[in-house]
C-alpha cells in the first residue's frame, strides 16, 4: 500500500471549486460531497454560484469528478498501478484539453490535493471557439451521462501519467456530440509516486436534480473501477 492510499480507507469529504470562462461567458461552480475509494463511489452536488450555467452540466462532469480519480477502486492485484492515490496528500496537477467535435474546446488546469481532511479539486477552465448556437452554448445536450473507459499510461519523463478518452454526449435530436480528452497528471510533491502499466478506468455516472434546490445545479453519483491488467502468472498457479 502506498502512503497516499492509506488516506482513502474510509469516506472522504470532497470540495470542488471551478472558475470558468467560455467564449467570454464567465461563471463559477462550487461542489461538495464525499468519495469512498473502497467502492469507487462518488456522490457530489454542484451549484453555479453566478446564476445560470452558460454551458450544459454534462460537459463539466469530466472536469469535476473525473478530476478526482483518486477515488477509483483499484482491485488488489492492481494497487501498484494507482498513481492518483500515491500522489496524496500533496496531490497532483491535472491538465486537460477537451476538443468538442465540430465545435470549440475547453482547456482546464486543476490542483487536486488534501486540505486538512478534505480532498479539494480547484479548477480553472477556459473555453474558446464555440458556436453560439452549437450543441454546447445552445444547450442542446440531454441531461444524462454515458459509461466510458478512461485509458491511462505512464509518463516517465514527467513522473506522471497521460490519459486519453472520448466522451459521448447525447444530443436532444438523438445524435451524439463527441468530446476528445487529452489529459496529463503530474505530482505536486517530490515524494515517490506509482507509475502504472497501461490500464483503464471504467466509469458509470448518473446525473439527477435535487427537487428542493432553487439554484442551477447538478447532482452526480459515480462509480469508477480500474481494470485492464490481469493477475500475474504466479496468481494463476496459487
Amino acid at each position: 500500500m502506498s502512503k497516499g492510499e492509506e488516506l482513502f480507507t474510509g469516506v472522504v469529504p470532497i470540495l470542488v471549486e471551478l472558475d470558468g470562462d467560455v467564449n467570454g461567458h464567465k461563471f463559477s461552480v462550487s461542489g461538495e460531497g464525499e468519495g469512498d475509494a473502497t467502492y469507487g463511489k462518488l456522490t457530489l452536488k454542484f451549484i453555479c454560484t453566478t446564476g445560470k450555467l452558460p454551458v450544459p452540466w454534462p460537459t463539466l462532469v469530466t472536469t469535476f469528478s473525473y478530476g478526482v480519480q483518486c477515488f477509483s477502486r483499484y482491485p488488489d492485484h492492481m494497487k501498484q498501478h494507482d498513481f492518483f492515490k500515491s500522489a496524496m496528500p500533496e496531490g497532483y496537477v491535472q491538465e486537460r484539453t477537451i476538443f468538442f467535435k465540430d465545435d470549440g474546446n475547453y482547456k482546464t488546469r486543476a490542483e487536486v490535493k488534501f486540505e486538512g481532511d478534505t480532498l479539494v479539486n480547484r479548477i480553472e477552465l477556459k473555453g474558446i471557439d464555440f458556436k453560439e448556437d452549437g450543441n454546447i452554448l445552445g444547450h442542446k445536450l440531454e441531461y444524462n451521462y454515458n459509461s466510458h473507459n478512461v485509458y491511462i499510461m505512464a509518463d516517465k519523463q514527467k513522473n506522471g501519467i497521460k490519459v486519453n478518452f472520448k466522451i459521448r454526449h447525447n444530443i436532444e435530436d438523438g445524435s451524439v456530440q463527441l468530446a476528445d480528452h487529452y489529459q496529463q497528471n503530474t505530482p505536486i510533491g517530490d515524494g515517490p509516486v506509482l507509475l502504472p502499466d497501461n490500464h483503464y478506468l471504467s466509469t458509470q455516472s448518473a446525473l439527477s436534480k435535487d427537487p428542493n434546490e432553487k439554484r442551477d445545479h447538478m447532482v452526480l453519483l459515480e462509480f469508477v473501477t480500474a481494470a485492464g491488467i490481469t493477475h500475474g502468472m504466479d496468481e494463476l498457479y496459487k
Epitope: L15, S30, G31, K45, D210, N212, E213
Partner: nanobody, 120 residues
Framework: QVQLVESGGGLVQAGGSLRLSCAAS?????MAWFRQAPGKEREFVGG????????YYVDSVKGRFTIDRDNAKNTVYLQMNSLKPEDTAVYYC?????????????????WGQGTQVTVS
C-alpha cells in the same frame, strides 16, 4: 452540535422593516433563513456562504431582504425592508457544516426554534 437562537421578530405594519438575528453557539458553514406560513411548507428565503462572498435570495424577497454575517460573533442577520402581509410567517435560521450555500432544506444540519414575524 451547534445551537442556533433567532431574535428580532415581532409585529410590524406593511411597508415597515425588521432585522432578524441568528446567533450560533460556534462556527458554522453556510447559513440561511427559511420561513413557514400557516398551512404551508417551510421555504428557503435567502442565504450566505461561510466566506460571505456568495448570497442568494428567492425572487419574492429580492431587493427587499438582505443577509449578512459576522463570523467573529458567529451571527447572521436578515434585514427585511418594505415588508408585505404575505411575508407573515415563522422565520427559521439554519446552518450547514459546509461552506457552500445550497437552498434545499435537507442540506442543513442545524436549525433554530424560529421567530414569528407578523405584517399587518
Amino acid at each position: 452540535q451547534v445551537q442556533l437562537v433567532e431574535s428580532g421578530g415581532g409585529l410590524v405594519q406593511a411597508g415597515g422593516s425588521l432585522r432578524l438575528s441568528c446567533a450560533a453557539s460556534g462556527p458554522t458553514g453556510a447559513m440561511a433563513w427559511f420561513r413557514q406560513a400557516p398551512g404551508k411548507e417551510r421555504e428557503f428565503v435567502g442565504g450566505i456562504s461561510r466566506s460571505g462572498t456568495d448570497t442568494y435570495y428567492v425572487d419574492s424577497v429580492k431587493g427587499r431582504f438582505t443577509i449578512d454575517r459576522d463570523n467573529a460573533k458567529n451571527t447572521v442577520y436578515l434585514q427585511m425592508n418594505s415588508l408585505k402581509p404575505e411575508d407573515t410567517a415563522v422565520y427559521y435560521c439554519a446552518a450547514r457544516r459546509s461552506q457552500i450555500l445550497f437552498t434545499s432544506r435537507t442540506d442543513y444540519e442545524f436549525w433554530g426554534q424560529g421567530t414569528q414575524v407578523t405584517v399587518s
